[in-house]
């Protein structure tokens, strides 16, 4: 079989809050009932993981309460919320997904969305 | 299905030899990255050797450069993993992974693996 194909969106610009939104969709070769996604963050080569959450098809995603990330789903497809983020934040976001139920498991990786994330200018002194 | 399939493995005394081989079966992409863990019981699993199929970037764990050659034979999808030099500390059971990347991913990264085969040991002891 082939890979499994991961589609998300090239670019993205988080807003002035630090948070940006991207679909991830995945052509699922098979009737996952259990799949997990990872988002993972690369920056000079360096890899690391940014969040996770494994999910039953029809129910929400849920992630872990210090998490950064939330998320749903709707089909083969993941709507990813990252908050928090700052201008050194910025890089490759990765999208890996794991169908892990039924047999056979299947792994798909994404080409990344490169989000850029701009700190706001903090606003000027008043003498009001 | 992607099936990986180890073999090779086995007990050799310390600084002896073994080669061992890793068939890839189920997968059609020409793209990916293959390569050679280790874990010990209650570790870690541990990236030893890595090779990219397309152009052939290879990494190593600092711990194994110059005792260790990974190499493959595309025709073959098969992977190998020369050992020389082989110490006490070099056992371990020995995985075959596979990362299903793009010329996008960092080489050999171990976050981007998921398919695994079943497993090899090697155990070195006099």
């Known amino acids: 079989c082939k890979a499994m194909h991961v589609a998300q969106p090239a670019v993205v610009l988080a807003s002035s809050r630090g948070i940006a939104s991207f679909v991830c969709e995945y052509a699922s070769p098979g009737k996952a009932t259990e799949v997990r996604v990872t988002v993972l963050r690369q920056a000079d080569s360096q890899v690391t993981e940014v969040c996770a959450a494994t999910y039953m098809m029809g129910n929400e995603l849920t992630f872990l309460d210090d998490s950064i990330c939330t998320g749903t789903s709707s089909g083969n497809q993941v709507n990813l919320t990252i908050q928090g983020l700052r201008a050194m934040d910025t890089g490759l976001y990765i999208c890996k997904v794991e169908l892990m139920y039924p047999p056979p498991y299947y792994l798909g990786i994404g080409n990344g969305t490169q989000i850029y994330v701009i700190d706001p200018e903090p606003c000027p002194d008043s003498d009001f | 299905e992607v099936q990986l399939v180890e073999s090779g493995g086995g007990l050799v005394q310390p600084g002896g030899s073994l080669r061992l081989s890793c068939a890839a079966s189920?997968?059609?992409?020409?793209?990916?990255?293959i390569g050679w863990f280790r874990q010990d019981p209650g570790k870690e699993r541990e990236m030893v050797s890595c090779?990219?199929?397309?152009?052939?970037?290879?990494k190593y764990a600092d711990s194994v450069k110059g005792r260790f050659t990974i190499s493959r034979d595309n025709s073959k999808n098969t992977v190998y993993l020369q050992m020389n030099s082989l110490r006490a500390e070099d056992t371990a059971v020995y995985y075959c992974?596979?990362?299903?990347?793009?010329?996008?991913?960092?080489?050999?990264?171990?976050?981007?693996?998921?398919?695994w085969g079943q497993g090899t040991r090697v155990t070195v002891s006099s």
């Open positions: 992974g596979l990362a299903p990347i793009s010329p996008v991913h960092a080489v050999c990264n171990q976050h981007y693996f998921g398919y």
């Open positions: 189920g997968f059609s992409s020409d793209y990916y990255d």
């Open positions: 090779i990219r199929s397309s152009g052939g970037s290879t």
